[in-house]
């Protein structure tokens, strides 16, 4: 049996009061002091079983210094076993022992839950010497107790390599319920059940839980902690909290918002970053995600042309980054572009449509009938061709690019010439004699350089050779050109 000191119970209508037969105290007091001084403590506690010899951790001295009479066994006196008090109160408790004067250098240490209490603790040891024995009172005080002060406190004393251990003094700090698990904010599917958890601890126990949804109590009667609330489904956002009750009162958890997942809002601010002949780089600002992460987006492209069939091209892309390069477009065309994104619930509406245009493209065909012949008198090569049949989308012709490669005895050199769009002939200087010259021509627009014509080769002899026959590419066709000398 243990003696308990306990503060007065504050009745709370929902819950049973203090344990029967227990005492409560919130007083700062010296408990169970066998005082030799005139000080009278506020509360006195007698041992649980007065007169019973204590046979626990005791040191039994062999003999006195004279070697004649035996001394009684050494033991700490019984004191209060259990102190119950509220958080932020002060508490003081003690151990006392009477030690024969033959023992020198006795020290008492305090231990909590098996660990020695060192440093900044308020422990005071007082000595009251008498003729044969010295009464030692070790007191320990805690100001403004906290839950972390809960535990089992003991005194230890070393005498002649023997250790004497006191009965434990159990300190129980009581307060309002303390949450160890609170409900968490969640995003949930409409009309789908989900769970919320609430757990709180004392002391004092029991702790009982009430759930609150949008300010209304869900459970009419308290549920023991921990409590799991299965919410049967929501059609709109709701706020949940839980109330934890014990004999000391009530603690309310944080309120958490439970959101209903929905389709995202449409993206906004679709903008054009770069246009080429066959691609457009766009970006957008994602709309609200509907409380569910975006999965992917869809870029929808319609050609704005009265003659087009109005079909929509759809390009799927990841939701991030919020950018996409639309490819495989026609040059010099107008398009209407919209973006839609999806989450687990579904697709958003399409963003506001924006207009964008591709630039003019490079020519898609090479110049025709390329003819090359040597003008030996002037020491240059004459090149002639026919203007290619380009589509409107390729834009206006701005000129031609001529590539001529000179090959002789393992040496190869490529040169490029640019000529205006009005020309259909050009002359280039002979770079090397006794060599082969290979000529290719490409049409050029603002959109870029088109494909080169098939190569036409002509042999440039050493000085004195005459060659008036031209080399040419057949028009049109893919047959290898013939070199005529």
């Amino acid at each position: 049996a243990i003696t308990e000191a306990r503060e007065e119970a504050k009745p709370y209508p929902l819950f049973p009061g203090p344990l029967p037969g227990s005492l409560q105290t919130d007083h700062t007091s010296l408990l169970s002091l066998p005082h030799t001084s005139g000080y009278q403590p506020a509360l006195m506690f007698s041992p649980t079983q007065p007169g019973r010899p204590y046979t626990g951790n005791v040191a039994i001295p062999r003999v006195t210094s004279a070697g004649s009479k035996l001394l009684p066994p050494l033991a700490f006196k019984h004191t209060v076993g259990h102190i119950i008090l509220s958080e932020h109160k002060d508490v003081k408790f003690n151990c006392s022992i009477s030690v024969p004067n033959i023992y020198q250098d006795t020290t008492i240490s305090w231990w909590k839950d098996g660990k020695e209490l060192l440093g900044a603790h308020h422990a005071i040891t007082q000595f009251y010497p008498d003729d044969e024995v010295t009464a030692i009172i070790a007191s320990f005080s805690i100001t403004s107790v906290q839950r972390s002060d809960n535990g089992s406190y003991i005194c230890k004393m070393k005498i002649n390599n023997e250790e004497i251990v006191s009965d434990p003094i159990y300190i129980e700090v009581q307060g309002l319920p303390h949450f160890t698990k609170q409900p968490e904010s969640m995003n949930v599917t409409r009309n789908t059940a989900f769970n919320l958890t609430c757990q709180a601890v004392g002391p004092p126990e029991p702790v009982n839980i009430f759930w609150v949804q949008n300010s209304s109590r869900v459970n009419e009667q308290p549920e023991k902690s921990p409590s799991v609330l299965t919410v049967p489904g929501l059609t709109e956002m709701a706020v949940f909290s839980c109330e934890a009750h014990n004999d000391k009162g009530l603690t309310v958890s944080k309120g958490v918002q439970i959101n209903i997942k929905a389709i995202p809002s449409p993206p906004t601010e679709v903008s054009i970053h770069n246009s080429t002949a066959h691609s457009i780089l766009i970006s957008w600002v994602p709309g609200f995600d509907g409380y569910s992460p975006f999965r992917n987006c869809s870029v929808q492209v319609k050609e704005v042309d009265p003659l087009s069939n109005g079909s929509v091209m759809i390009f799927n892309t990841s939701a991030s980054p919020h950018m996409y390069q639309i490819k495989q477009l026609q040059a010099l065309a107008n398009y209407s572009i919209g973006v839609s994104c999806m989450n687990e619930i579904g697709w958003s509406a399409v963003s506001p449509w924006i207009l964008a245009s591709t630039t003019e493209g490079a020519p898609s065909v090479a110049p025709l009938n390329v003819t090359v012949f040597l003008n030996e008198s002037r020491d240059n090569v004459d090149i002639r061709w026919m203007k290619p049949l380009t589509k409107r989308q390729a834009g206006e012709l701005v000129g031609y690019r001529i590539s001529h490669v000179w090959q002789s005895a393992g040496i190869s050199k490529e040169l490029l010439e640019e000529v205006g769009q009005n020309n259909s002939r050009a002359q280039i200087s002979v770079q090397v004699h006794n060599a082969t010259c290979t000529v290719r021509i490409a049409a050029v627009t603002k959109g870029g350089v088109g494909p080169f014509s098939d190569p036409v080769k002509i042999f440039i002899p050493a000085h004195g050779w005459v060659d008036h026959a031209p080399s040419s590419t057949p028009a049109p066709g893919n047959a290898d050109p013939v070199l005529i000398i």
């Epitope: 009309n191 759930w211 869900v218 609330l229």
Partner: antibody
């Protein structure tokens, strides 16, 4: 299994009192509230209120204060409805029901017919 | 208090037909419960919290709704479904019931 068993029919004179019992079994009585519902002949259901079986605290709906008293004997897992100063208009079937979360009445007693007639 | 209005008061249908019962609340409520009552019997729980079937209730019963408008649907009436149906709100005290809808055989 969960059961709510109500006392038998009562025939009372105006001005008398009646006490209807509702004995619960198959669950921990003090974990769930007990609701009382009235149904007058040929009429719909009318919620009278409930009693907290953990604290014994009753809650009465408007129109059921004064002459109506909810009580408990937790030792025998029983809830009681007492009506005093009976009137002819108190003639009805009185049901007890177990209250679950969200005030859902998940189990019902079989009902007790109280007839008030001179 | 929240007043619950059930409509229609009486619904005359044949077995196999679809029954749609309405319950309107005078102000918004989070959940609606539904009960079935046959003559001389206690009410029987049917639907918990708007759309959850009570144990042992067949899948032809379903509930839906939110705010102030709730519906109980019986997809194909069986002979044993002809009864009176009551809605009951959860959100605020007192815990009110609707006036009931009687589903009778046509």
């Amino acid at each position: 299994q969960v059961q709510l068993v109500q006392s038998g029919s009562e025939l009372k004179k105006p001005g008398a009192s009646v006490k209807v019992s509702c004995k619960a079994s198959g669950y921990t009585f003090t974990n769930y509230g007990v609701h009382w519902v009235r149904q007058a002949p040929g009429q719909g259901l009318e919620w009278m209120g409930w009693i907290n079986t953990y604290t014994g605290e009753p809650t009465y709906a408007q129109g059921f204060t004064g002459r109506f008293v909810f009580s408990l004997d937790t030792s025998v897992s029983t809830a009681y409805l007492q009506i005093s100063s009976l009137k002819a208009e108190d003639t009805a079937v009185y049901y007890c029901a177990r209250g679950y979360r969200y005030a859902y009445m998940d189990y019902w007693g079989q009902g007790t017919l109280v007839t008030v007639s001179s | 208090e929240i007043v619950l209005t059930q409509s229609p008061a009486t619904l005359s249908l044949s077995p196999g037909e679809r029954a749609t019962l309405s319950c309107r609340a005078s102000s918004s409520t989070s959940y609606m419960h539904w009960y079935q009552q046959k003559p001389g019997q206690a009410p029987r729980p049917l639907i918990y919290a708007t759309s959850n079937l009570a144990s042992g209730i067949p899948a032809r019963f379903s509930g839906s709704g939110s705010g102030t408008s709730y519906t109980l649907t019986i997809s194909s009436l069986e002979p044993e479904d002809f009864a009176v149906y009551y809605c009951q709100q959860w959100s605020s005290n007192p815990r009110t019931f609707g006036g009931g809808t009687k589903v009778e055989i046509k």
